[in-house]
Interface confidence: low
């Protein structure tokens, strides 16, 4: 014992002066604590603690349960202890069957011995089953058996403390180890939908699913840039021992425009945190926005196909869609479909398929769509490009030669003179008069052009060519001249 200088308080002394004492069941335990400032005896074993204010602790008939640590404390808080074993062949173990282990930590199987002289103090599996190969333990007769570094796989492991007594193995009552898992990853969080679009007054409800190894994971819904506590409801399940799931449902019963924003589901455990967000947009009323996927002014060649395509956003869902031409509604040749199968999709596509367009089918094609709140429309102006057609080619009474041609875009008419029997008419003749006849008519039909030249300018036999052309193609008509003397005997028009 360390020497104590005079005046300095010293710990109490205990009789008998030994650290351990072994008595037989039924014998007397007599412990004397000597100290001028005696305060109390304290007895501890397992979960039990008892106190005695007498300086002599006497137990007349010792029982196995009197095994434990007896501590004498003085008024200076200094203490001394003796450990008493009450040897009872019928009760070799004192047990506290409460057995929890935290993963990766040590845990104590509390089965202290009443007889320190038994041998082979160890752990055994229940019903003769072997213990896990990697289970390591350290026995301590006064405390129990320490399992080192508890594994998750030991959860619900059934075991006994065991000793050998007179050559036989004696088992304690059974213990069942309950392992509390350590967090080795952040929680897994997911949200029912990444975005919500609602009208004022509608209910907003979103569910966050949190998965982790135990229910001690923390979770909450937060509004970004706000400290307001949100009202949420929970459901939770244990799918097996280390597979916990919680559903946290956030509800705003009547959403307002200023409820719009980003909501975060946040979860954390001792390993770290995770979050997932959902976006809420609340509008005062529904809307439809149409986006043409091609130019709204369309030029197409005669006989070719064209697809008029629009994308549109509609909220709430579109209820009526139609394509109209010349006050007539298409019953076929068009299709309307959602841009994605996503539940929160608000974008749709509508396509009108125009096939082998004729020159007479130019005009305004209109797409109309409506939902419960609004209507919207978009118009396409379709122009059909046609090769010029010469409608008439005549010699007028006044001696003029006149050519009338129709087509789109507006045809240009050129005149050529071919002397004699020449096949190639190359000398161009300037027209006297050119008129676009239907410029005030409907804007999408063929354009009609009339051009005239004075036939008196021709003094020789030959052919006059009227050539009408545009971007699509060309067409010609011919006038033949034959002179007899000074008179033009014949003018034969032909194409």
């Amino acid at each position: 014992q360390p020497s104590v200088s005079p005046g300095e308080p010293s710990p109490p002394s205990i009789h008998p002066g030994k650290s351990d004492l072994i008595v037989r069941v039924g014998d007397e335990i007599r412990l004397l604590c000597t100290d001028p400032g005696f305060v109390k005896w304290t007895f501890e074993i397992l979960d039990e603690t008892n106190e005695n204010k007498q300086n002599e602790w006497i137990t007349e008939k010792a029982e196995a349960t009197n095994t434990g640590k007896y501590t004498c404390t003085n008024k200076h808080g200094l203490s001394n202890s003796i450990y008493v074993f009450v040897r009872d062949p019928a009760k070799l173990f004192l047990v506290d069957r409460s057995l929890y282990g935290k993963e990766d930590n040590d845990t104590l199987v509390r089965c202290p011995l009443t007889d320190p002289e038994v041998t082979n103090y160890s752990l055994k599996g229940c019903q003769g089953k072997p213990l896990p190969k990697d289970l390591r333990f350290i026995p301590d007769p006064k405390a129990g058996i320490m399992i080192k570094s508890v594994k998750r796989a030991y959860h619900r492991l059934c075991l006994h403390c065991s000793v050998d007594q007179e050559g036989k193995s004696v088992l304690s009552e059974k213990f069942i180890l309950k392992v509390r898992p350590a967090f080795k990853a952040v929680p897994v969080v997911s949200v029912s939908k990444a975005s919500y679009l609602l009208r004022e007054g509608e209910e907003f409800t979103v569910t966050c699913t949190i998965k982790d190894v135990s229910s001690s994971v923390y979770s909450t819904w937060k509004r970004e840039n706000s400290q307001t506590k949100l009202q949420e409801k929970y459901n939770s399940w244990h799918h097996g021992d280390f597979n916990y799931e919680r559903q946290a449902t956030l509800t705003i019963s009547s959403a307002r425009v200023n409820d719009s924003g980003v909501f975060m589901c946040y979860a954390n455990n001792t390993f770290g945190s995770a979050n997932v967000t959902t976006t809420l947009e609340v509008v005062d009323k529904g809307f439809i926005n149409i986006f043409p996927m091609i130019n709204t002014t369309v030029f197409v060649n005669d006989g070719e196909n064209v697809d008029l395509i629009v994308e549109y956003e509609a909220f709430p869902k579109p209820e009526h869609q139609q394509w109209i031409y010349m006050n007539r509604t298409f019953t076929d040749k068009w299709e309307d479909y959602p841009k994605s199968e996503n539940e929160s999709n608000i974008r749709y596509v509508s396509e009108l398929h125009l096939t082998r367009l004729k020159g007479t089918e130019g005009g305004t094609y209109t797409f109309l769509v409506s939902n419960s709140d609004v209507n919207a429309a978009i118009a396409f102006n379709v122009y059909v490009n046609t090769k010029p057609e010469i409608l008439t080619y005549d010699r007028l009474v006044n001696g003029m030669l006149q050519c009338v041609a129709a087509g789109f875009p507006e045809p240009t008419i050129d005149w050529y003179f071919c002397p004699g029997t020449e096949q190639r008419c190359s000398a161009s003749v300037l027209p006297v008069d050119v008129q676009t006849l239907n410029s005030s008519g409907p804007p999408f039909g063929k354009l009609v052009v009339q051009s005239s030249i004075d036939s008196s300018a021709f003094k020789h036999n030959g052919t006059v060519e009227c050539k009408a052309y545009n971007d699509v193609g060309k067409t010609s008509a011919y006038f033949n001249f034959a002179f007899k003397g000074n008179n033009k005997e014949q003018i034969h028009p032909h194409t």
Epitope: L46, E48, S98, R156
Partner: antibody, heavy 123, light 107 residues
Framework: QVQLVQSGAAVKKPGESLKISCKGS????????IGWVRQMPGKGLEWMGI????????RYSPSFQGQVTISAGKSISTAYLQWSSLKASDTAMYYC????????????????WGQGTMVTVSS | AIQLTQSPSSLSASVGDRVTITCRAS??????LAWYQQKPGKAPKLLIY???SLESGVPSRFSGSGSGTDFTLTISSLQPEDFATYYC?????????FGGGTKVEIK
Amino acid sequence: QVQLVQSGAAVKKPGESLKISCKGSGYRFTSYWIGWVRQMPGKGLEWMGIIYPGDSDTRYSPSFQGQVTISAGKSISTAYLQWSSLKASDTAMYYCARHGRGYNGYDGAFDIWGQGTMVTVSS
Amino acid sequence: AIQLTQSPSSLSASVGDRVTITCRASQGISSALAWYQQKPGKAPKLLIYDASSLESGVPSRFSGSGSGTDFTLTISSLQPEDFATYYCQQFNSYPLTFGGGTKVEIK
């Protein structure tokens, strides 16, 4: 003998904070879970959460998560239940209780109960 | 969360009567069920744990039975001190939950 002794009744205003206590004696405090149970006036029992004082591992009921904090001082064998901002709806009797032994591999029933702490929140 | 439904919610009985209270779980909870007695102004008291084990110091007229989803608390011969409210509680999985209670009154 084994017992849990709770702190006295508390009267508070909405928005105030509060911490109530539960002191264990007569057993090894660090080796048993301590739970908290709420009983609103005229109503049934509601489990709030538990703590293992040995390492302060806590489990909360989802209904109370984020509303209260459970803690423990193992050196003084005391568990705590606290609120940072009380509401009128927090008015209730609060009991602490010890998880006894369940021999079937589960955490056990509440075998020892405190006497209860009445919390009244009123403006 | 596991829901516990107690029935009846209240009953009237006389001293000496045999009283049975049932507790039904929304999913299987093995035998992880306890029964408590609570008198007005007092803390609850544990009667039965692990569905059928009698807590130390509780009179033998109290018994529990059942496993899985259906459980019963029986008082074989009702005594004057037994008039109280009785609660079941599951401790199979978190969150731990209580039944709504059964009030036993004097007829």
